[in-house]
């Protein structure tokens, strides 16, 4: 397993509709054709997997149908969007990138993006 640098923004504020987007960029040391991206959430010293997708370079990221994540890739950048967030989902969201194929296998873990989600003030038909 070889290390790889992964960069992501320090802080993102979710929209009032509970949507947060951020870019996860990795320094690919080779010509990977298969990449796996995983979003982890760290809160109260617990780390949980939020979503994951494997994609072939040049193709779209494919998350599971019921995933709260969507994403697109462009070169060594992955644009991630997480939806359905509410205040209790505030936490550190860590981007983990694995270059699966061809060998050698590379692993990179970002420092995390602190996503802040605010419960909006009550008003007619507002989003929670």
């Amino acid at each position: 397993c070889k290390a790889m640098h992964v960069a992501q923004p320090a802080v993102v504020l979710a929209s009032s509709r509970g949507i947060a987007s951020f870019v996860c960029e990795y320094a690919s040391p080779g010509k990977a054709t298969e990449v796996r991206v995983t979003v982890l959430r760290q809160a109260d010293s617990q780390v949980t997997e939020v979503c994951a997708a494997t994609y072939m370079m040049g193709n779209e990221l494919t998350f599971l149908d019921d995933s709260i994540c969507t994403g697109t890739s462009s070169g060594n950048q992955v644009n991630l969007t997480i939806q359905g967030l509410r205040a209790m989902d505030t936490g550190l969201y860590i981007c983990k990138v694995e270059l699966m194929y061809p060998p050698p296998y590379y692993l990179g873990i970002g420092n995390g993006t602190q996503i802040y989600v605010i419960d909006p003030e009550p008003c007619p038909d507002s989003d929670f």
Partner: antibody
Framework: QVQLVQSGAEVKKPGASVKVSCKAS????????MHWVRQAPGQGLEWMGI????????NYAQKFQGRVTMTSDTSTSTVYMGLNSLRSEDTAVYYC????????????????WGQGTLVTVSS | DIQLTQSPSSLSASVGDRVTITCRVS??????LNWYRQKPGDVPELLIY???NFQSGVPSRFSGSGSGTDFTLTISSLQPEDVATYYC?????????FGQGTKLEIK
Amino acid sequence: QVQLVQSGAEVKKPGASVKVSCKASGYTFTSYYMHWVRQAPGQGLEWMGIVNPSSGSTNYAQKFQGRVTMTSDTSTSTVYMGLNSLRSEDTAVYYCARDPPITMVRGAPFDYWGQGTLVTVSS
Amino acid sequence: DIQLTQSPSSLSASVGDRVTITCRVSQDISSFLNWYRQKPGDVPELLIYRSSNFQSGVPSRFSGSGSGTDFTLTISSLQPEDVATYYCQRTYNAPYTFGQGTKLEIK
């Protein structure tokens, strides 16, 4: 085990107010949102609002704005739903139901419901 | 407001039949849809969350599918205890609207 225990049935006159309680146990109270849903006799389910027990933040269905108040008491792990200016069409069974953050592992929204509280509004 | 329209509003089927209930949403809600069963006189029980996830303890004859605006609840082999009213509900954000319900009876 997880339990949501609601207060007993109420009979109220039109124009009066009612306050229904929902006491939670068996899980971390402040880690889940709580919803209130009502069901008039022979009718479908109607979402009323949501409260964040940790912060007290609320959001109400437009239909109930100005008439409903949802609060929480973390010391007793209880949420309350108050409805004022009662009318006959408010006669219904009122339910509380918990809802985890979306990122909670194996967390399912509305997985546990209270047993329901019948509120009858009649002159 | 976002509307949820269930169809049919009622249906009668025989034990062992495959039953399908649909829920159409007026706006894209991704996969943020729940399905509930409410037996007569009972509290609603969660069957499926986020379109296709089984709630623990729910019989495997129940399954959910769909994304965006069109969702389906399928009962692969109808059982007598499935006599109930079924509701869909959006869980994306407030308001967490329910469909009007589908009443299922046994022939």
